[in-house]
């Protein structure tokens, strides 16, 4: 091959952790040169020589040669960041070349130390135990020591320290994190022992204390919502259920929810507590079934909530609204529009419920005497009638396939409302029906048993 000068490439370590050793290695690759006669030299940015270099024998590849040279630099010099690069110089009969080889930027960053303490109800087992978690984050280089102290004395057992991990970052210097956990007894924690997470990094010590005395009392933000029974739930389940929703509980073990009657008499209350929410709070529900006649009489029912975070019980009282005028709904069943059927895709049947009061209404669709899956229809929330103050309207839309409709299948819209004589009315439509068919039916008990 013909004689040619080398092409130079910088060689820098991919692993950005030169702090692990006392020196940092960078290199220079010379490629495609001929003849095999090459001399490497290295200089700092200020042109002073670098002595600690190491050359590697040249290699013949495709009729031309390649060779590399490595330089070792003290870590501490690199980490001070005075030089962004060093210079690789090459002498060759066909021309001298030089290349800037960047130095890895090594930031020396201190750790941020945080200790996470268990919640009040976070102790389990016998004896009851939990964990303190110490997290050191954002530090560099990666060498670090984590230890635990109790009342200033080193803790020997119950400590687990994970491996140091690089933190996920898109740019900037590589930083690290480490987690250490200490298993503690509830008796020690509640006894107000002072626990300390000690982190040693680059000759400096960082400490974070944890004690049950130091856990701030959160502002009491517990909220109570008393939810009355809906007509739909009474109609469907044949029970009148009062619901008391309690939210923003810091702990669940000390909550009590009770319903009482107007005369102070207790009502049997069934309490359910949620799993912990993402914001580390709990919610609880206290449900009580009552006699429908007691509810309809207008009697007041009170939900009382007690909790250790509450200086005094929270109470919410509800009763059935008085003086609400009863107006029975008019129900109209509208078959699919001819234009829609011409598209041969789906058929939309609309049940229009108008002029009712109060707003509580229940709509269900049936086919061949069986309730249809609620996924097949959409029922709007009751809305005020524009021309009739105090009255409401709603609509329910059932979608079936065009084929189903054309088979002559019948569809029934069942509407339940407390102002209806039998609490329920229905309308039926099929392909042969021009308008809507009315049927104020009695005896729907069997329907609601399903």
């Amino acid at each position: 091959g013909s004689a040619s000068a080398p092409t130079l490439f910088p060689l820098v370590s991919c692993e950005n952790s030169p702090s692990d050793t006392s020196s940092v290695a960078v290199g220079c690759l010379a490629q495609d040169f001929l003849p095999d006669s090459i001399t490497f030299s290295w200089k700092y940015k200020n042109n002073s020589d670098i002595s600690s270099t190491r050359g590697f024998p040249s290699v013949l590849r495709g009729g031309k040669y390649a060779a590399t040279s490595q330089v070792l630099l003290p870590s501490k010099d690199v980490m001070q960041g005075t030089d962004e690069h060093v210079v690789c110089k090459v002498q060759h009969p066909n021309g001298n070349k030089e290349k800037n080889v960047p130095l890895p930027v090594i930031a020396e960053l201190p750790p941020k130390v945080s200790v996470f303490v268990p919640p009040r109800d976070g102790f389990f087992g016998n004896p009851r135990k939990s964990k303190l978690i110490c997290q050191a984050t954002g530090f560099s280089p990666r060498q670090i020591q984590v230890s635990w102290l109790r009342e200033g004395k080193q803790v020997g057992s119950g400590v687990t320290t994970d491996q140091v991990q690089a933190e996920a970052k898109e740019s900037g210097p590589t930083t690290y994190k480490v987690t250490s956990t200490l298993t503690i007894k509830e008796s020690d924690w509640l006894g107000q022992s002072m626990f300390t997470c000690r982190v040693d990094h680059r000759g400096l010590t960082f400490q974070q204390n944890a004690s049950s005395m130091c856990v701030p009392d959160q502002d009491t933000a517990i909220r109570v919502f008393a939810i009355p029974p809906s007509f739909a739930s009474i109609f469907l389940t044949k029970s009148t259920k009062l619901t008391c929703l309690v939210t923003d509980l810091t702990t669940y073990d000390s909550v009590t929810i009770s319903w009482t009657r107007q005369n102070g008499e207790a009502v049997k209350t069934h309490t359910n507590i949620s799993e912990s929410h993402p914001n580390a709070t709990f919610s609880a529900v206290g449900e009580a079934s009552i006699c429908e006649d007691d509810w309809n009489s207008g009697e007041r029912f009170t939900c009382t909530v007690t909790h250790t975070d509450l200086p005094s019980p929270l109470k919410q009282t509800i009763s059935r609204p008085k003086g609400v005028a009863l107006h029975r709904p008019d129900v109209y069943l509208l078959p699919p529009a001819r234009e829609q059927l011409n598209l041969r895709e789906s058929a939309t049947i609309t049940c229009l419920v108008t002029g009712f009061s109060p707003a509580d209404v229940f709509v269900q669709w049936m086919q061949r005497g069986q309730p249809l899956s609620p996924e097949k229809y959409v029922t709007s929330a009751p809305m005020p009638e524009p021309q009739a103050p105090g009255r409401y309207f709603a609509h329910s839309i059932l979608t079936v396939s065009e084929e189903e409709w054309n088979t002559g299948e019948t569809y029934t819209c069942v509407v339940a409302h407390e102002a209806l004589p039998n609490r329920v009315t229905e309308r039926t439509v099929d392909k042969s029906t021009e308008g809507e068919v009315s049927a104020d039916e009695e005896g729907f008990e069997n329907l609601w048993a399903t």
Epitope: S258, R261, G264, A266, K268, S289, D294
Partner: antibody, heavy 120, light 110 residues
Framework: EVQLLESGGGLVQPGGSLRLSCAAS????????MNWVRQAPGKGLEWVSV???????YYADSVEGRFTISRDNSKNTLYLQMNSLRAEDTAVYYC??????????????WGQGTLVTVSS | QSVLTQPPSASGTPGQRVTISCSGS????????VNWYQQLPGTAPKLLIY???QRPSGVPDRFSGSKSGTSASLAISGLRSEDEADYYC???????????FGGGTKLTVL
């Protein structure tokens, strides 16, 4: 005929365990709250535990953490699992049905009782 | 020590009227219904009065109940020898989340 029939009593050593059963008949068992009430020899009645039709359970302070009430509506049976038994748990144990599904209006149906003796 | 307080014993002659008292607090009798039970020797308790003054079917009208404030009482008129039994008052205690009984009153018909 509405009936409750307890079983499972007997002699047990302190620290031991016992499981009482109460078979119900003649009524819709799953719709009622069910209680266990005990009576130590020569002493008065003491309420032990209740299980609501919805599944909620409550216990007297004297048995909290040691006794567990449960029910199997498909078998019309009420249970009381008693652990870490003490001499003072010696009593006749009755199961009893709540009168009213909504309010605390007493217990209208009682079993004949089963004797639990805790002694070494 | 029972949460509800009853006299340990009471007595009367046949035909007489006898009253048994039961006192409690606002967390039980004060706000909740009082129920009464009769326990004949060697048998299970039987509900005698519920919701302060209601009689289950089959209970003679000689038995009556009343409640005032945090106290209640059971009255038996026209006392009979078969009324000789232990009588217990019972209520729900809202602070304890459970039923509470009185210590029982042993009625002797002389």
């Amino acid at each position: 005929e509405v009936q409750l029939l307890e079983s499972g009593g007997g002699l047990v050593q302190p620290g031991g365990s016992l499981r009482l059963s109460c078979a119900a008949s003649g009524f819709t068992f799953g719709s009622y709250e069910m209680n266990w009430v005990r009576q130590a020899p020569g002493k008065g009645l003491e309420w032990v535990s209740v299980i609501y039709s919805g599944g909620s359970t409550y216990y007297a302070d004297s048995v909290e953490g040691r006794f567990t009430i449960s029910r199997d509506n498909s078998k019309n049976t009420l249970y009381l699992q008693m652990n870490s038994l003490r001499a003072e748990d010696t009593a006749v144990y009755y199961c009893a049905r709540d009168t009213n599904p909504y309010y605390y209006y007493g217990m209208d149906v009682w079993g004949q009782g089963t004797l639990v003796t805790v002694s070494s | 020590q029972s949460v509800l307080t009853q006299p340990p014993s009471a007595s009367g002659t046949p035909g007489q009227r006898v009253t048994i008292s039961c006192s409690g607090s606002s967390s039980n009798i004060g706000n909740n219904a009082v129920n009464w039970y009769q326990q004949l020797p060697g048998t299970a308790p039987k509900l005698l009065i519920y919701r302060n003054n209601q009689r289950p079917s089959g209970v003679p009208d000689r038995f009556s109940g009343s409640k005032s404030g945090t106290s209640a009482s059971l009255a038996i008129s026209g006392l009979r020898s078969e009324d000789e039994a232990d009588y217990y008052c019972q209520s729900y205690d809202s602070s304890l989340n459970g039923q509470v009984f009185g210590g029982g009153t042993k009625l002797t018909v002389l």
